[in-house]
Interface confidence: medium
């Protein structure tokens, strides 16, 4: 583990798994509210690579509800509203940290977990594989 | 807090702030690898709304370095490579959980924090405001 002189005022951990198991304050501080109160947008409808949002729920996880983007089309929407299949709608994926109850159903013991979510879609030029 | 009957075998928390302060195993489990290997992509270059990645650093946070997407253009890139200013490149934002040391410099006590990051960009039809 890390050899750090313990500051007075630091919580002490007697857990044999320290420093893998630590105390975490779940009174989640949100750094965004003051700077960006209006986060939700209608980009999912206005994008040339529009997407639908699907609800993924798991009561053993925090956050328990995660919304996943699914691109509506394989291609991208043109100005006339038709789909251009020479372009591709692709999901922009991102890993997020979540907390999973471990052991299951225990209210105050968690494991950090990384999960991959699709946040939205973007329109890209396809990669063309030329056959010799 | 969550009203869950305590299982035998669950760690006990004597913390007066329970369940705000919990034990978290930091041995991060990755749900992606087996089912969905990382597909970190070159979409940032191939998108009609391409973006650059900018470094944001904070040593008291995990992860300490976060690379944020910044759209390259106000408009969107057309097939001929020119920018179409009748369309808009906009950032897709997502909240992620990060860990912050609290009290500062304490090695085994953390607070979860939500921050808003720009993950990538998408091309949208602009909202036109007609002046009477």
């Amino acid at each position: 583990g890390i050899a750090i002189p313990r500051n007075s005022g630091c919580p002490n951990s007697e857990d044999k798994n320290f420093p893998r198991t630590v105390m975490v304050n779940l009174n989640i501080h949100n750094r965004n509210t003051s700077t960006n109160p209006k986060r939700s947008s209608d980009y999912y409808n206005r994008s040339t690579s529009p997407w639908n949002l699907h609800r993924n729920e798991d009561p053993e996880r925090y956050p328990s509800v995660i919304w996943e983007a699914k691109c509506r089309h394989l291609g991208c929407v043109k100005a006339d509203g038709n789909v251009d299949y020479h372009m591709n709608s692709v999901p922009i994926q991102q890993e997020i940290l979540v907390l999973r109850r471990e052991p299951r159903h225990c209210p105050n013991s968690f494991r950090l977990e990384k999960i991959l979510v699709s946040v939205g879609c973007t329109c890209v030029t396809p990669i063309v594989h030329h056959v010799a | 807090g969550i009203a869950i009957p305590r299982n035998s075998g669950c760690p006990n928390s004597e913390d007066k702030n329970f369940p705000r302060t919990v034990m978290v195993n930091l041995n991060i489990h990755n749900r992606n690898t087996s089912t969905n290997p990382k597909r970190s992509s070159d979409y940032y270059n191939r998108s009609t709304s391409p973006w650059n990645l900018h470094r944001n650093e904070d040593p008291e946070r995990y992860p300490s370095v976060i690379w944020e997407a910044k759209c390259r253009h106000l408009g969107c890139v057309k097939a001929d490579g020119n920018v179409d200013y009748h369309m808009n490149s906009v950032p897709i934002q997502q909240e992620i959980l990060v860990l912050r040391r609290e009290p500062r410099h304490c090695p085994n006590s953390f607070r979860l924090e939500k921050i808003l990051v720009s993950v990538g960009c998408t091309c949208v039809t602009p909202i036109v405001h007609h002046v009477a």
Partner: antibody
């Protein structure tokens, strides 16, 4: 400018232990990790293990499990690698490297070794 | 464990020539592949991260491409100072591994 300065060359006998230090300066220490990589004479690079300073979480390559211990001291911004039960096969240059632990292009804790120490030459001989 | 293979093992090149080094992973590693240059008696130096991202301070003649299992490092217009050994490095799964290296010599 980030700099990693390692302790000096060592000559050891088989069965002895080795402890190398890696002092970091010029950047945040707690926000990063330190990995250890070795290179036997005329050979390629071999990852031994690494530590995430923020948590003190350590990962070791299976090959070195039980023989290697990686620690760090935030107060002196120094990482350490201890290797026990030395044999002549452990004769190598040992490098420490900074592991940024970044959130990159949508992924947590991605790793590339962006700064390296100058290397510590270790000779194990009876 | 992910095994990286590099080709060629050795390349002797004339200055201003284009050099291509390939790295193949035994499993899909996405874009978690980095390239390092090591000159004799020096520490490795990061050239390219995440398959294709350039590093500030590294000359623009160095570029990388690929994803999944096949990756390429390209030196467009080799210079005398580019002599050394080039390693690919995967950080997708533990244990992290390096390729065996490609030695580039100047003719």
């Amino acid at each position: 400018e980030v700099q990693l300065v390692q302790s000096g060359a060592e000559v050891k006998k088989p069965g002895e232990s080795l402890k190398i230090s890696c002092k970091a300066s010029g950047g945040s220490f707690s926000g990063y990790g330190t990995s250890w990589v070795r290179q036997a004479p005329g050979q390629g690079l071999e990852w031994m293990g690494g530590i995430t300073h923020f948590f003190g979480a350590v990962d070791y390559a299976q090959k070195f499990q039980g023989r290697v211990t990686i620690t760090a001291d935030e107060s002196t911004t120094t990482a350490y690698m201890e290797l026990s039960g030395l044999t002549s096969d452990d004769t190598a240059v040992y490098y420490c490297a900074r592991d940024p632990n970044e959130f990159w292009n949508g992924y947590y804790a991605t790793h590339d070794f962006d700064y390296w120490g100058q290397g510590t030459t270790v000779t194990v001989s009876s | 464990e992910i095994v990286l293979t590099q080709s060629p093992d050795f390349q002797s090149v004339t200055p201003k020539e284009k050099v291509t080094i390939t790295c193949r992973a035994s499993q899909n590693i996405g874009a978690e592949l980095h390239w390092y240059q090591q000159k004799p008696d020096q520490s490795p130096k990061l050239l390219i991260k995440y398959a294709s991202h350039s590093i500030s301070g590294v000359p623009s003649r160095f570029s990388g491409s690929g994803s999944g299992t096949d990756f390429t490092l390209t030196i467009n217009g080799l210079e005398a100072e580019d002599a050394g050994t080039y390693y690919c490095h995967q950080t997708d799964r533990l244990p992290y591994s390096f390729g065996p290296g490609t030695k580039v010599d100047i003719k």
